[in-house]
């Protein structure tokens, strides 16, 4: 699609994974395409096969090593190429000079748990997964709580402007079922974006004591 629109977007999880999405108007669903990664100062190179995720969109993960290994640094540049098969040859469709630490998207936070719950408040903690030690404390979080009768989209966002892996939710309703999610973002990187939301954590506030005002 010479005059069509294509998009090649990749993110580094800060450790050992580059996830890429390639989309192109008018491309055939059964087109065979790959992403090739060539770092400028590393001995390795890596390839992944783009698999269809929607009508004209393909995705794949470049696995660079063990999940917690630090495979790239702030000075690395990785040349990423999309190659698609045309008959017997591979044709380069897109090229990007990828700066990993300018294009960060971390893994969703994990291990959410209720530390303490009362009638009107709940203390929740979580952990970050596969996040580089380079960030030190330069991370921020967003959290949201799903109340009965509402959708996630309606839930107000709570912003934690520091590396704080817990939150105390207040002004909750007694004996009520809630769900909670959190996501994380490094402060570094021009094209850096939020991680996916964590798996929801369900919890219930304690009932109000009988005969007492709430």
């Amino acid at each position: 699609a010479v005059n069509g629109t294509s998009q090649f977007t990749c993110f580094y999880n800060s450790r050992a994974n580059i996830s890429c999405v390639w989309s192109q108007d008018g491309a055939l669903q059964d087109t065979s395409c790959q992403v090739h990664a060539w770092p400028d100062r590393r001995r390795w190179n890596q390839t992944c096969e783009l698999l269809p995720v929607s009508q004209a969109s393909w995705a794949c993960n470049l696995i660079l090593g063990a999940p917690d290994s630090q495979k790239l640094t702030t000075v690395d540049i990785v040349t990423l190429r999309v190659l698609c098969r045309e008959g017997v040859r591979w044709r380069v469709m897109a090229i990007q000079d990828f700066k990993p630490f300018e294009n960060l998207r971390l893994m969703a936070p994990i291990s959410l748990q209720v530390v303490h719950v009362e009638t009107h408040r709940c203390n929740i903690s979580w952990e970050i997964s596969q996040a580089s030690h380079y960030f030190e404390r330069h991370l921020e979080f967003e959290a949201r709580t799903l109340s009965p009768g509402h959708t996630w989209e309606e839930a107000p966002l709570l912003t934690l402007k520091q590396k704080q892996e817990w939150i105390c939710l207040e002004t909750l309703t007694p004996d009520t079922q809630y769900e909670f999610q959190v996501r994380v973002k490094p402060l570094q990187g021009e094209f850096t974006t939020w991680s996916p939301w964590s798996q929801p954590l369900a919890f219930r506030t304690k009932p109000a004591a009988l005969g007492k005002d709430t």
Epitope: I77, I95, D97
Partner: nanobody, 123 residues
Framework: QLQLVESGGGLVQPGGSLRLSCAAA????????VGWFRRAPGKEREFVAA????????LYADSVKGRFTISRDNAKNTVYLQMSSLKPEDTALYYC????????????????WGQGTQVTVSS
């Protein structure tokens, strides 16, 4: 805002050579991958060549491969299109364009455009 200015066009005989330049005003071009496109009279605008700024990786249209070379000069903040073995069918208005991150053959993937420089190949 990135403003692109092309130069170097002109009249040349078949088999001759020409070098087009693309310079930036307003912002450093070195932050952007750059492509060259052309529009021949009565035809659609078509992709010619493109280059990424850091690694210097290149893409070419099949019709110009082996005859045209795209390059960049970091010190001069300029991208060049060296055209040789020119043919009458290379006659067109040549545009320089900058993309945000990725070079492709699709003109819709480029965000900033110059006004163009005319290349005429004729005896």
């Amino acid at each position: 805002q990135l403003q692109l200015v092309e130069s170097g066009g002109g009249l040349v005989q078949p088999g001759g050579s020409l070098r087009l330049s693309c310079a930036a005003a307003g912002r450093a071009i070195e932050n952007y991958p750059v492509g060259w496109f052309r529009r021949a009279p009565g035809k659609e605008r078509e992709f010619v060549a493109a280059i990424t700024w850091i690694s210097g990786s290149t893409l070419y249209a099949d019709s110009v491969k082996g005859r045209f070379t795209i390059s960049r000069d970091n010190a001069k903040n300029t991208v060049y299109l060296q055209m040789s073995s020119l043919k009458p069918e290379d006659t067109a208005l040549y545009y320089c364009a900058a993309a945000l991150k990725t070079i492709t053959r699709g003109q819709n993937d480029y965000s900033y455009w110059g006004q163009g420089t005319q290349v005429t190949v004729s005896s």
